[in-house]
C-alpha cells in the first residue's frame, strides 16, 4: 500500500478534548469537545464520540484520560480499561487498536485516600475511509474531567 | 485555517533532554539541553525553557518526566502535577495545553520503600508564531535527572 | 541538518505488535509481529527485534508496554524498566534514546493481589541508514501479552 | 533445576504437635513467598496461608489460625509448618508450594507430607 | 471469600476426545485464574496460569479462557496420560481459594 502526501494538500489531525458532557454512564465510548477552546478537526469528522476518517491512510492516534478517586471501592475491579477501538463498516464488532490495564486505586497512600492516575496511549494505525475510531474506558465513573486538558482524544496522518 | 507542508521546506521538530540545571527550585518552567546528545532544535527555537514557534501551525508536543522517591514524605503532596502549558503575547497567564495529576508515592511496597513514576503527555495544539511552550511539574523536587533519557520535552509540526 | 520531505516519496512508517514469541527470556530485546493483524513495515525494515532505518532522517519513535502481576517480588527492587534503544554500527554499546523506570507491584490493594500498569515512551530522534531501535524491559517476566494491543513499538518519519 | 523437597509421613497422636519442613533449591529462596496447602483424603485443595521469606511475616487463611505456625530458616532455604495439639481431622498430605509474583499462581510444589493423626 | 464452584464433578472421555471443564467465580478475579492437574499420591501440576497462559513444557492440547468469572480449560485430543484430578485456582485475592475439583476419567 503505498501513501502519498502531496504537498498541496492538508494533513488531517484532530484533537478532542474532554467535556462535562464526555461521560454518558451508557456503556457507549466517551463523548468529546470539537471546536471549544482546544479542540480542532481538520480533514477529519466526528459523529457521536467517533473520529470518523475521510481520507484512508496511516494515522497515529492518541487518547490520555485523567482517572481518580478516593480509596479503593470494593464494587469495581481495581482494574481499569483504556482502549481505542475502531469501528468499520466491513464487521460488525469494535476491533481494538490500543489498549491498557491499569490498577490506580492502589495508590492511595497511608496518609491520604485520595488518588490520582493517567493513561496515556499513542501509535499509528491504518484506516481506511468512513472508518471510525472511538475512546472506551471501563469503569468510566473514575475518568476525571475538568477543563479539556486532562482527558482527550486525537489523531493525524504520518 | 489551511496549513499547507510544501515539499522544499523542512519541517520543524525539537527534542529536549533533562540535565542537571533542569530543575530551578524557583517556581519557573523546567530547562531543558538543547543541543548535546540527543537534544535537537530543527525549525524552533529555544528560550528559558520554553520552545519558541518559528512557524504557525499545529504541533504534536510531548514530554515525559521521570518520578521517584523514597516513600511518601509528609511535607509534600501526594499528587504530582504534569503539564503543558503555552505563553502567548495576547494573553498574559499561562494558559493549559496538556495535563496530568499522578499520585506515585502510593507505590512504595512492603519491601522497598523506594518508588519510581513516569508521566508522559502528548498531543496536538495549533501554535502562533512567536508563541512558546514550557514544561512544568509540582512538586519538581521528585523529578529524577539522570543522562535526557527519562526526562524529556519535544514537538513537531503536522 | 536539513532533511526534505519530497511529495512523492512515501513517509516511512511502522507499527509492531506484541506476540507469544516476544519475550525470549535470553536477556535480548523484545520480539515482535511485523505483518499480521495491526502490525506493518512501511519504508523501515525488521531484524531481531529492531526496527532498522533505511532513509535517515527525523523519527517519532514509541513503544508501549503492558505490564502485570500478582503482589511484589519479594526482596527485589520492585522496579522495572522500560526503554528505547540504539544500535549503531558507530559503536559497540547500544545508546539509551528513552527510558522510563516504575514501581508498579504497589498498585496491588488490600482486596486484589494483581495489579496492572503500562508504560509508554514516545520522542523524536534522529537516525542514520543502517541504525537500529530495540525494546528493553526489565524484568520482562512482568510483560503482559495478549492480542497485540496492549504492548507495541512503532516509528515515523516526522 | 527448582525443587521442593519435604520430610517425610508423620504419624502422630491426637495433642502432639508435628513439624513439617520444605527444603527450596534452585532458585532464590527469598524472592518468593511460600504457601502451604492441605488436602484430606479424597477430598480438594485448600490454602492454609503464607509466609514472607523475605520478611518472615506470616499470613494465615482464617480456618488455619491458632494451631497452626509459619516459620523459616532461611540460610538454609527452609520453610517450616508446625500444628500444635493435633486433632484427628489434622490428617491430610500438606504441601509447600512456591507463590510467583510474575502472575504464575503456585509454580512449583513440593511432593508433600502425609500427616495421619490417630490414637 | 471468593467460592469457585467447578463442574462436572466427574467426565468421562475416550482418548482422542475433546473435553471441557468449567469454572466459575464468585466474585470478578480478572485473569488470576490458575489450572492445575493432579494425578493420585502426586502434588498438582500447574498446567496454565493468567487463566490462559501455558506453564513451561506443558503440550499444547491444553488451552484455557475466560476473564472475570467464567474460565474454561480445554484439553484436545485427550491422551491416556491426562487422565487424573483437574483444579482450578484463584490467586487475585485472599484467601486464595480452589475449585472442588474434576476427575477425568476413561469411558
Known amino acids: 500500500l503505498i501513501q502519498e502526501r502531496r504537498s498541496h494538500e492538508v494533513n488531517p489531525a484532530a484533537h478532542l478534548t474532554g467535556a462535562n458532557s464526555s461521560l454518558t454512564g451508557s456503556g457507549g465510548p466517551l463523548l468529546w469537545e470539537t471546536q471549544l477552546g482546544l479542540a480542532f478537526l481538520r480533514g477529519l469528522s466526528y459523529h457521536d464520540g467517533a473520529l470518523v476518517v475521510t481520507k484512508a491512510g496511516y494515522y497515529y492516534i492518541y487518547s490520555k484520560v485523567q482517572l481518580g478517586g478516593v480509596g479503593c471501592p470494593l464494587g469495581l475491579a481495581s482494574t481499569i480499561t483504556h482502549g481505542l477501538y475502531k469501528r468499520t463498516p466491513r464487521y460488525p464488532e469494535e476491533l481494538e487498536l490500543l489498549v491498557s490495564q491499569q490498577s490506580p486505586c492502589g495508590r492511595a497512600t497511608s496518609s491520604s485516600r485520595v488518588w490520582w492516575d493517567s493513561s496515556f496511549l499513542g501509535g499509528v494505525v491504518h484506516l481506511e475511509a468512513g472508518e471510525k475510531v472511538v475512546v472506551r474506558v471501563l469503569d468510566e465513573r473514575l475518568v476525571r474531567l475538568r477543563d479539556g486538558t486532562r482527558s482527550y482524544f486525537g489523531a493525524f496522518m504520518v | 485555517l489551511i496549513q499547507e507542508r510544501r515539499s522544499h521546506e523542512v519541517n520543524p521538530a525539537a527534542h529536549l533532554t533533562g540535565a542537571n540545571s533542569s530543575l530551578t527550585g524557583s517556581g519557573g518552567p523546567l530547562l531543558w539541553e538543547t543541543q548535546l546528545g540527543l537534544a535537537f532544535l530543527r525549525g524552533l527555537s529555544y528560550h528559558d525553557g520554553a520552545l519558541v514557534v518559528t512557524k504557525a501551525g499545529y504541533y504534536y508536543i510531548y514530554s515525559k518526566v521521570q518520578l521517584g522517591g523514597v516513600g511518601c514524605p509528609l511535607g509534600l503532596a501526594s499528587t504530582i502535577t504534569h503539564g503543558l502549558y503555552k505563553r502567548t503575547p495576547r494573553y498574559p497567564e499561562e494558559l493549559e495545553l496538556l495535563v496530568s495529576q499522578q499520585s506515585p508515592c502510593g507505590r512504595a511496597t512492603s519491601s522497598s520503600r523506594v518508588w519510581w513514576d513516569s508521566s508522559f503527555l502528548g498531543g496536538v495544539v495549533h501554535l502562533e508564531a512567536g508563541e512558546k511552550v514550557v514544561v512544568r511539574v509540582l512538586d519538581e523536587r521528585l523529578v529524577r535527572l539522570r543522562d535526557g533519557t527519562r526526562s524529556y520535552f519535544g514537538a513537531f509540526m503536522v | 541538518l536539513i532533511q526534505e520531505r519530497r511529495s512523492h516519496e512515501v513517509n516511512p512508517a511502522a507499527h509492531l505488535t506484541g506476540a507469544n514469541s516476544s519475550l525470549t527470556g535470553s536477556g535480548g530485546p523484545l520480539l515482535w509481529e511485523t505483518q499480521l493483524g495491526l502490525a506493518f513495515l512501511r519504508g523501515l525494515s525488521y531484524h531481531d527485534g529492531a526496527l532498522v532505518v533505511t532513509k535517515a532522517g527525523y523519527y517519532y519513535i514509541y513503544s508501549k508496554v503492558q505490564l502485570g502481576g500478582v503482589g511484589c517480588p519479594l526482596g527485589l527492587a520492585s522496579t522495572i524498566t522500560h526503554g528505547l534503544y540504539k544500535r549503531t554500527p558507530r559503536y559497540p554499546e547500544e545508546l539509551e534514546l528513552l527510558v522510563s523506570q516504575q514501581s508498579p507491584c504497589g498498585r496491588a490493594t488490600s482486596s486484589s493481589r494483581v495489579w496492572w500498569d503500562s508504560s509508554f515512551l514516545g520522542g523524536v530522534v534522529h537516525l542514520e541508514a543502517g541504525e537500529k531501535v530495540v525494546v528493553r524491559v526489565l524484568d520482562e517476566r512482568l510483560v503482559r501479552l495478549r492480542d497485540g494491543t496492549r504492548s507495541y513499538f512503532g516509528a515515523f518519519m516526522v | 533445576q527448582i525443587q521442593l523437597l519435604q520430610s517425610g509421613p508423620e504419624l502422630e497422636k491426637p495433642g502432639e504437635t508435628v513439624k513439617i519442613s520444605c527444603k527450596a533449591s534452585?532458585?532464590?529462596?527469598?524472592?518468593?513467598?511460600m504457601n502451604w496447602v492441605k488436602q484430606a483424603p479424597g477430598k480438594g485443595l485448600k490454602w492454609m496461608g503464607w509466609i514472607n521469606t523475605y520478611t518472615g511475616e506470616p499470613t494465615y487463611a482464617d480456618d488455619f489460625k491458632g494451631r497452626f505456625a509459619f516459620s523459616l530458616e532461611t540460610s538454609a532455604s527452609t520453610a517450616y509448618l508446625q500444628i500444635n495439639n493435633l486433632k484427628n481431622e489434622d490428617t491430610a498430605t500438606y504441601f509447600c508450594?512456591?507463590?510467583?509474583?510474575?502472575?504464575?499462581?503456585?509454580?512449583?510444589w513440593g511432593q508433600g507430607t502425609s500427616v495421619t493423626v490417630s490414637s | 471469600d471468593i467460592v469457585l464452584t467447578q463442574s462436572p464433578k466427574f467426565m468421562s472421555t475416550s482418548v482422542g476426545d475433546r473435553v471441557s471443564i468449567t469454572c466459575k467465580a464468585s466474585?470478578?478475579?480478572?485473569?488470576?485464574v490458575a489450572w492445575y492437574q493432579q494425578k493420585p499420591g502426586h502434588s498438582p501440576k500447574l498446567l496454565l496460569y493468567w487463566a490462559s497462559t501455558r506453564h513451561t513444557g506443558v503440550p499444547d492440547r491444553f488451552t484455557g479462557s475466560g476473564s472475570g468469572t467464567d474460565f474454561t480449560l480445554t484439553i484436545s485430543n485427550v491422551q491416556s496420560e491426562d487422565l487424573a484430578d483437574y483444579f482450578c485456582h484463584q490467586y487475585g485475592s485472599y484467601p486464595l481459594t480452589f475449585g472442588a475439583g474434576t476427575k477425568l476419567e476413561l469411558k
Open positions: 508450594a512456591r507463590d510467583n509474583w510474575d502472575g504464575k499462581g503456585m509454580d512449583y
Open positions: 534452585g532458585y532464590t529462596f527469598t524472592n518468593y513467598g
Open positions: 466474585q470478578d478475579v480478572d485473569t488470576a
